[in-house]
Interface confidence: low
């Protein structure tokens, strides 16, 4: 069933690009599920965390809600306090 509104990761795209520090964790969690090997390597090749996150977000337009939930779950595991902070904002 369709869900109204933007997904959390789309709502907070700018903040996530700026504030996520543990991109490797996200890649591990998403690899083989929503990220291909080529995409995984492309994100890892970026020099900074913000550029890694920008590259990761370049793939999300093709993801459905469930795929985005996987990213949110990985974020909750790696930087739970960041997710909680954004949920309050």
């Amino acid at each position: 069933a369709a869900k109204p509104g933007l997904h959390f990761i789309d709502q907070h795209r700018a903040a996530l690009i700026a504030r996520v520090t543990n991109v490797e964790w996200l890649l591990d969690a998403l690899y083989g599920k929503v990220l291909t090997d080529e995409q995984y390597q492309a994100v890892r090749a970026e020099p900074t965390n913000p550029s890694k996150m920008r590259k990761l977000f370049s793939f999300t337009p093709a993801w459905n809600w469930t795929c985005k939930d996987l990213l949110l779950q990985a974020l909750r595991e790696s930087q739970s306090y960041l997710v909680e902070d954004l949920e309050r904002s």
């Epitope: 490797e24 964790w25 591990d28 909750r76 595991e77 739970s80």
Partner: nanobody
Amino acid sequence: QLQLVESGGGLVQPGGSLKLSCAASGFTFSRYAMSWYRQAPGKERESVARISSGGGTIYYADSVKGRFTISREDAKNTVYLQMNSLKPEDTAVYYCYVGGFWGQGTQVTVSS
């Protein structure tokens, strides 16, 4: 009940070393990635190092690469953080983390 207990913190001079330990219980340790985070006064908690289950994937924050080493001993349900060439900016409370759970933290102070 899941429990994470850190130890090994203390006061050390710049250039010195410390080895932190995190003893885990209440879950199947070998199946989970384990992480170390730190939080300095007035700053956001930041990721320091992470080791995957099996130890095949290791991540380090840029600020500690080449100085810190994370390792795990599944037989002892323990993850370690060996910290060498410590700097004053490494002063923080260091936390062990797994899947939404945090330890109580151990204070590391680097000062002459």
